[in-house]
Interface confidence: low
């Protein structure tokens, strides 16, 4: 009996997602089955379906397939979150490039190479032809889209709408041209799904035909989506397991991007004298291992054969015989010239954090005079003398010009979080520099000499909107949506700014996010009149270790009876112990009877020492953290969301004093919650709001 091919690899999976048809004319076919693979096979073969299947949803709870003649890009359709659903879309219908001759291309390009609009396949005007959709079933001769039903050399083509030009090929690029990678492709997250010899890749979430350990849930940061080529383990370039039982894995043909730059976040900070982190950015000239044995040249295979060559690891600077860390080892290393010792670590290179001199700062770094001139995201600092006007705009004293030389990282405004610089990039006007506080430095960064205890509330009276005191509503509460589902809470602190947590952003693509304001129900049910849905235009990450993010909205929120801002506390303020506070959140539990309504839990402020005792000494709190416990011992957990606020009231004024972040728990009996202390970061927040441009309403 002929073994049926497994076709699920031809589909792009979106977990916990389904499609809802808004247009009632669209058809759907359903059937009980056991696995998503069965759904895929039927969709691919169109067996027993009254339409061309472009996508399907597998309902894991009901063990049911829903086949669709549309996909998420079709009109009259919307995506919706659903725990029990997985959406699979045929890649051929969403791909915008061709593989080989483009026989399987089913995209929507409908213009020829010279720019002529295509003639519909079902039309005989202006050109009569025999390529009827009914004669070429399965070739998707729909509308006037470019196709290659016979697999001819030139790739997809069409009859043209110009009577003078019968047919012409379309300018659709090869997927191997579109896809490109930097360095050895460790950060590659593209859609190449076949190997250099043309074999289709095996899905990472499948164990057939090859069993493997690279499971998406085990390595969530490796981008193991569908069956796309990846480089999770420091290979020379991306690879995948193949569907050929006789070929376990193979490299993929992905070219190096012409502009061979990496994303800022992927660039290890380059150092020449010392090791930062694991030393992946070390570019110095030490060329012996720890005990003095000289290193073997990277481009030599003697005395040790290896594949760590400059050709295989293009961005790792494998020059001469210098110590390097091309593969994510614990520190720089090299092959040695001793035939009996294959490799050795160059552990004599000092750690930047340990090195003395100006590689660290004391206090808040206002006296730092080192010569680092790069921000933590790798941007080059711009000259101070070009930015004096901006600097004067947010400080109220004359900066010490003698310190502001060249473009070195400095702290002219007494920033609590260390040296920084201007960047010259209009999107990121300034940022902190990657310098740590000196080891053992205990100088407090918040110095309040005049006022030993600063009140958190500003001394203004409670504002009233349309006669309703704002403290009675929770209009500042934001639901951050990720791919159409609620993922985190947040607080609207200004019309264009939401304060939330760093952990709320699993994807770098801002198109994946929306902010919902003015809602009480997490799904927006019954909130249609008051709901505002805003796109996200930028994420500004907080100072190192803060876990905070300021999320800039694509347009300002409209403040009304349902949407309002919440106040920030004074910088460095202290809130008295036992102050009554609340945490808010939708606290989605995944339960069937979950009502989706915003919840509140009442907590009280607890001193840091007492808080540490309640955590069995496991955590030491610092000045950037604030602790709050349940009012009654034994009361249940607070049902907040990451990014959501700890809101306290002082002098009849409500303020966001804390932000919920993962890994600290909240209001467990005897185990109080630890929040990011907003007062510690208040100056940073004000500085961002003042210096970053926002769209006008």
């Amino acid at each position: 009996q002929r073994k049926r091919r497994n076709t699920i690899h031809e589909f792009k999976k979106s977990a916990k997602t389904t499609l809802i048809k808004i247009d009632p004319a669209l058809k759907i076919k359903t059937k009980k089955v056991n696995t998503a693979d069965q759904c895929a096979n039927r969709c691919t073969r169109n067996k027993g379906l009254p339409f061309t299947c472009k996508a399907f949803v597998f309902d894991k709870a009901r063990k049911q397939c829903l086949w669709f003649p549309f996909n998420s890009m079709s009109s009259g359709v919307k995506k919706e979150f659903g725990h029990e659903f997985d959406l699979y879309e045929n890649k051929d219908y969403i791909r915008n490039c061709i593989i080989g001759k483009g026989r399987s291309y089913k995209g929507t390009v409908s213009i020829t190479k010279s720019g002529i609009k295509c003639q519909p396949w079902s039309s005989m005007i202006p050109h009569e032809h025999s390529f009827l959709p009914s004669s070429y079933r399965g070739k998707d001769l729909q509308e006037n889209y470019c196709r290659n039903p016979r697999g001819e050399e030139g790739g997809p083509w069409c009859f043209t709408s110009n009577p003078e030009v019968r047919y012409e090929v379309c300018d659709i690029p090869q997927c191997s041209e579109v896809e490109c990678m930097t360095c050895n492709g460790e950060s590659y997250r593209g859609l190449m799904d076949h190997t250099e010899s043309g074999k289709i890749c095996q899905r990472w979430d499948h164990q057939t035909p090859h069993r493997h350990k690279f499971l998406p849930e085990r390595y969530p940061d490796k981008g193991f989506d569908d069956n796309y080529c990846r480089n999770p383990d420091g290979q020379p370039r991306p690879w995948c397991y193949t569907l050929d039982p006789h070929t376990r894995w193979e490299y993929c043909a992905i070219k190096t991007c012409a502009d061979n730059t990496m994303n800022d976040t992927d660039v290890p900070l380059e150092t020449t004298e010392c090791i930062q982190g694991q030393g992946e950015g070390y570019r110095g000239t030490v060329n012996t291992i720890w005990n003095g044995i000289p290193c073997q040249r990277w481009d030599s295979q003697y005395p040790h054969e290896h594949d760590m060559t400059p050709e295989n690891f293009k961005c790792k600077d494998l020059r001469e015989n210098y110590c390097r860390n091309p593969d994510g080892s614990e520190s720089p290393w090299c092959f040695t010239t001793d035939p009996n010792i294959r490799v050795g670590y160059c552990s004599q290179i000092p750690n930047c954090d340990m090195s003395h001199g100006q590689d660290c700062y004391r206090g808040n770094g206002k006296n730092y005079m080192g010569n680092l001139s790069q921000t933590r995201s790798g941007l080059t600092c711009s000259m101070w003398d070009k930015n004096m006007e901006d600097l004067h705009r947010h400080i109220f004293w004359e900066p010490d010009a003698s310190k502001l030389n060249e473009n070195y990282c400095r702290n002219p405004d007494d920033d609590a979080h260390g040296p920084w610089c201007y960047t010259g990039n209009p999107l990121i006007p300034w940022d902190y520099c990657p310098i740590s506080r000196c080891e053992g430095d205990t100088t407090p960064t918040i110095v309040n000499l005049d006022h030993p205890v600063i009140s958190c509330a500003k001394t203004k009276q409670l504002r009233v909107v349309n006669g309703i005191p704002t403290r009675t509503n929770i209009g500042w509460m934001v639901s951050l949506r990720y791919r159409n589902k609620h993922i985190c809470g947040g607080s609207l602190i200004k019309e264009s700014w939401v304060l939330t947590a760093r952990q709320c952003f699993p994807s770098r693509d801002l198109k994946d996010y929306e902010a919902w304001l003015g809602i009480h129900d997490v799904h927006g049910r019954g909130d249609e009149k008051c709901k505002q849905v805003l796109n996200v235009s930028q994420l500004v990450y907080g100072p190192e270790g803060s876990d905070l993010v300021l999320m800039k909205l694509a347009r300002p929120a409209v403040l009304d009876d349902f949407v309002s801002t919440i106040d920030l506390p004074n910088y460095g303020c202290t809130i008295p112990e036992k102050t009554s506070c609340s945490v808010y959140g939708w606290g989605y539990t995944g339960l069937i009877n979950y009502d989706g309504l915003l919840r509140v839990a009442h907590l009280y402020i607890m001193g840091n020492e007492k808080c540490s005792q309640h955590h069995r000494g496991k955590v030491t709190l610092n000045e950037s953290e604030i602790c709050a416990g349940a009012e009654k011992i034994g009361s249940g957990p607070c049902e907040g969301d990451y990014g959501g606020p700890l809101v306290c009231e002082q002098h009849k004024m409500r303020m966001v004093l804390g932000v919920i972040v993962p890994g600290r728990g909240c209001a467990i009996p005897n185990r109080p919650g630890i929040f990011v202390r907003v007062a510690y970061y208040a100056k940073w927040i004000h500085k961002i709001i003042l210096t970053y441009k926002v769209p006008q309403s």
Epitope: E217, R218, P220, G545, V583, G585, G587, Y588, T589, G590, A601, K618, V619, G636, P637, C638, E639, G640, D641, Y642, I660, P662, G663, R664, G665, C666, A667, I668, R671, G673
Partner: nanobody, 121 residues
Framework: EVQLVESGGGLVQPGGSLRLSCAAS????????MGWYRQAPGKQRELVAV???????NYADSVKGRFTISRDNAKNTVYLQMNSLKPEDTAVYYC???????????????WGQGTQVTVSS
């Protein structure tokens, strides 16, 4: 649910070294703090060392400078490297993990079965 299995205990002479391992079934990526506690006969269980998901560590004063805790997320394992061991380090060593749930307030405390460390000449 996370299961913790300790290994590496044994008999060692004063001044010697041991490396304890604690392997977690399931992923430790969702776990905030993983740590080692010990209980000597007739004494309370006490914290030895703890490491959180960001790599920050905390040690009991009695072991500072001698013991090092580390974790390997890829191997779902936390280690305790014990150097310059003393007779007073003799105890049953327990691995502990705090797993925080999907939202603040859900916390699960997991314990291993323990591994015996005896320091004696």
């Amino acid at each position: 649910e996370v299961q913790l299995v300790e290994s590496g205990g044994g008999l060692v002479q004063p001044g010697g070294s041991l490396r304890l391992s604690c392997a977690a079934s399931g992923s430790i990526l969702g776990i905030n703090a993983m740590g080692w506690y010990r209980q000597a006969p007739g004494k309370q269980r006490e914290l030895v060392a703890v490491i959180n998901s960001g790599g920050s560590t905390n040690y009991a004063d009695s072991v500072k400078g001698r013991f090092t805790i580390s974790r390997d997320n890829a191997k779902n394992t936390v280690y305790l490297q014990m150097n310059s061991l003393k007779p007073e380090d003799t105890a049953v060593y327990y691995c502990n993990a705090d797993e925080w749930g999907d939202y603040p307030g859900q916390v699960y405390d997991y314990w291993g079965q323990g591994t015996q460390v005896t320091v004696s000449s």
